[in-house]
């Protein structure tokens, strides 16, 4: 799976938040950022994730698509120069320091499962998605694809406004 | 190559409702959004809503949410759209449209039926 | 309901001309805009997409741009098969919406 610019195609500012209405919040304790999932009190402001969108060459063709066999693949940056990361070791997401160009456990294809909600699968560990556990994200394995409507990797996005790059 | 081969013209009278067809060929049909748009007699174009034949979810613009049923069938790679209490203001061209992206809806166009007319009349 | 206008409704131009049409947003939607090309009799099809980013196949003569509310489509090199209506859309957010069209006629 390639991707196919070096630039994002979209970018949008938003907020992420979980199947069933809670938020993902980023805190930084000891240097590093922790990735929560939590009920926000009423007028708690959500955090703010920029989602940028690449289009990525789907690695096989035997669909018969040809060129046209795109996908959508997402990385996810609540604060500058940190992106989620898919550790597939350890089946966790977390937040990493990282430099462009951003290393493939950066990358998530973006699967709309329902109308309104996302799902994200690792691209270096296909059929593994961002999911929820114990309150916090984690790598989550789909096994087929009648899973991928599980609630716990399906996500809401609220977005605030367009993110205009350069 | 992709294709998205529509069913044909119908002549239909007020208060009927109609199904019309779009069989998917060329692509992994569960793998992408299908949408549908209408395009009345020298008019501009309405999208009417999409769905996901892989899971059946779809999403609608409410204008047309009690107007149209989206459904698929997944064995035939067709997709269908049926239309209740037909009036002569559901008149129009419709296309079956899908996407140029595996797994997500931008709602963007990239490949279109042949359009299906529809004239509701007595 | 974010609305699409499209300006002007129609222009005369000749092969060879360089052409500029025009779609504004009623409100702010970024660079989620695509313009299709609708030929006499046929289905429309896709031609930019993002704002400026040229679909697979689709001729370098056309090229997209703006950002926000305000954005153009512009034809170098104006060939026959352009004769067409051209329509933008905002795409990404539900429900996409098309402007009303711009017809391009050839002299």
């Known amino acids: 799976m390639s991707i196919t610019g070096i630039s994002p195609i979209t970018e949008y500012l938003a907020s992420l938040s979980t199947y069933n209405d809670q938020s993902i919040t980023f805190a930084l304790e000891d240097e590093s950022y922790e990735i929560y999932v939590e009920d926000l009190k009423k007028d708690e402001k959500k955090d703010k994730v920029l989602l940028s969108y690449y289009e990525s060459q789907h690695p096989s063709n035997e669909s018969g698509d040809g060129v046209d066999g795109k996908m959508l693949m997402v990385t996810l940056s609540p604060t500058k120069d940190f992106w989620l990361h898919a550790n597939n070791k350890e089946h966790s997401v977390e937040l990493h320091k990282s430099e462009k160009p951003l290393p493939d456990q950066a990358f998530f294809v973006l699967h709309n499962m329902h109308s309104n909600s996302v799902s994200f699968e690792s691209k270096t560990d296909p059929g593994v998605f961002i999911g929820v556990k114990d309150n916090h994200l984690a790598l989550i394995k789909v096994d087929s694809s009648e899973n991928l409507s599980t609630e716990n990797i399906l996500f809401k996005l609220s977005e605030t406004h367009h993110h205009h790059h350069h | 190559q992709v294709n998205l081969l529509q069913s044909g013209a119908t002549l239909v009278k007020p208060g009927a409702s109609m199904k019309m067809s779009c069989k998917a060929s060329g692509y992994s049909f569960t793998d992408y959004w299908v949408s549908w748009v209408k395009q009345s007699h020298g008019k501009s174009l309405e999208w009417i809503g999409e769905?996901?034949?892989?899971?059946?979810?779809?999403n609608f613009n409410k204008e047309f949410k009690d107007k149209a049923t989206l459904t698929v069938d997944k064995s035939t790679s067709t997709a269908y759209m049926e239309l209740t209490r037909l009036t002569s203001e559901d008149s129009a061209v419709y296309y079956c449209?899908?996407?140029?992206?595996?797994?997500?809806?931008?709602?963007?166009?990239?490949?279109w039926g042949q359009g299906t007319l529809v004239t509701v009349s007595s | 309901i974010i609305v699409m206008t499209q300006s002007p409704k129609s222009m005369s131009i000749s092969v060879g001309d360089r052409v500029t049409m025009n779609c504004k947003a009623s409100q702010n939607v970024g660079n989620n805009i695509a313009w299709y090309r609708q030929k006499p009799g046929q289905s429309p099809e896709l031609l930019i997409y993002?704002?400026?980013n040229r679909y697979t196949g689709v001729p370098d003569r056309f090229t997209g741009g703006g950002y926000g509310t305000d954005f153009t489509l512009t034809i170098n090199s104006v060939q026959a098969e352009d004769a067409a209506f051209y329509y933008c859309q905002r795409i990404y957010n539900s429900p996409p919406t098309f402007g009303g069209g711009t017809k391009v006629e050839l002299k």
């Open positions: 449209t899908r996407g140029p992206y595996y797994y997500s809806s931008q709602i963007i166009f990239a490949y």
């Open positions: 993002y704002a400026s």
């Open positions: 769905i996901y034949p892989n899971s059946g979810a779809n």
